[in-house]
């Protein structure tokens, strides 16, 4: 791997549990300065691979609030606006950390998570497998 | 929102902070145990909007490795094998959040932060905006 | 047309196996994860067994694990349920369908098979 070198400045790690447990500052700096606004808040509906956006919140982990994708159909929509099922709607999967309230219900300690959250949907050319 | 009673076996928050700093466990707890390894992996290709992937490294975040979809193209692939203009491919962007070493070069102390990443792509009709 | 039809269902004893069949037609199951449910009388439908696409990896129900083995045969198109050391609690109606933490459900239940466990 890359190795750092340290800045003279750092907090104190003399923590027994260091490396694994640090300091973070929960006042998030967003960098996305350059974006739409909008995203891709319309996409969902007028994609031929068309999802629903469902809420999951939990209280014990932050952020508490995610927006779970699902795919509307199993087949995509065709040009005519019905459903073809030559076609899969897939889900677009991606693992993204959250932070874990641990013990539960502290306010000031956590611990990383990896879930895996459906972001969209996206049409694919389906897989045959043909009998032997 | 949502009170959450305070667990007496936290950890002590007297840090002057505090709530703005938190400890964080960075030993991952992974809850992906149902999913699926392959998951969108061969997507990417089979999609009629294809993507790319690239590396975004940085060792300055955690994690250091992002992989950002880019689409091959403005259009989508039709039943031909073609590229059809009259469809758009469009990037699938998720906000996520990683940990950003604050100060710089520290191995235990973190800053959350926000960024936007394309995770995939999907194929939409355009808007199409007619002249007065 | 969509439809997934269930089989292998019956009155079986306490301690007995069963194995239930999904046949999936109208589309191509090898994208999909596939999950089996079930609902007993004046109960709501439980997840009980998902095996991702590609039989990548299976996940149970904390109350059927050990017993019961789900599989997927994309071939045939068709999905299954080994169910070992049957309990009168798996007494319901059982029902194949995408997995539906990724997909809207609704549309693909099919009439599901019958499982009755009694002495």
């Known amino acids: 791997g890359i190795t750092i070198p340290r800045n003279p400045g750092c907090p104190n790690s003399e923590d027994k549990n260091f490396p694994r447990t640090v300091m973070v500052n929960l006042n998030i700096h967003n960098r996305n300065t350059n974006t739409n606004p909008k995203r891709s808040s319309d996409y969902y509906n007028r994609s031929t691979s068309p999802w629903n956006l469902h809420r999951n919140e939990d209280p014990e982990r932050y952020p508490s609030v995610i927006w779970e994708a699902k795919c509307r159909h199993l087949g995509c929509i065709n040009a005519d606006g019905n459903v073809d099922y030559h076609m899969n709607s897939v889900p677009i999967q991606q693992e993204i950390l959250v932070l874990r309230r641990e013990p539960p219900h502290c306010p000031n300690s956590f611990r990383l998570e990896k879930i895996l959250v459906s972001v969209g949907c996206t049409c694919v050319t389906p897989i045959v497998h043909h009998v032997a | 929102g949502i009170t959450i009673p305070r667990n007496p076996g936290c950890p002590n928050s007297e840090d002057k902070n505090f709530p703005r700093t938190v400890m964080v466990n960075l030993n991952i707890h992974n809850r992906n145990t149902n999913t699926n390894p392959k998951r969108s992996s061969d997507y990417y290709n089979r999609s009629t909007s294809p993507w790319n992937l690239h590396r975004n490294e940085d060792p300055e975040r955690y994690p250091s490795v992002i992989w950002e979809a880019k689409c091959r193209h403005l259009g989508c692939i039709n039943a031909d094998g073609n590229v059809d203009y009259h469809m758009n491919s469009v990037p699938i962007q998720q906000e996520i959040l990683v940990l950003r070493r604050e100060p710089p070069h520290c191995p235990n102390s973190f800053r959350l932060e926000k960024i936007l990443v394309s995770v995939g792509c999907t194929c939409v009709t355009p808007i199409v905006h007619h002249v007065a | 047309q969509v439809q997934l039809v269930e089989s292998g269902g019956g009155l079986v004893q306490p301690g007995g196996s069963l194995r239930l069949s999904c046949a999936a037609s109208?589309?191509?199951?090898?994208?999909?994860?596939m999950s089996w449910y079930r609902q007993a009388p004046g109960k709501e439908r439980e997840l009980v067994a998902t095996?991702?696409?590609?039989?990548?990896?299976?996940n149970y129900a904390d109350s059927v694990k050990g017993r019961f083995t789900i599989s997927r045969d994309d071939a045939k198109n068709t999905v299954y349920l080994q169910m070992n050391s049957l309990k009168p609690e798996d007494t319901a109606v059982y029902y194949c369908?995408?997995?539906?933490?990724?997909?809207?459900?609704?549309?693909?239940w099919g009439q599901g098979t019958q499982v009755t466990v009694s002495s």
């Open positions: 095996i991702t696409s590609a039989g990548g990896s299976t």
């Open positions: 109208g589309f191509i199951i090898s994208d999909f994860p």
């Open positions: 369908n995408v997995d539906w933490k990724w997909y809207e459900v609704d549309d693909y």
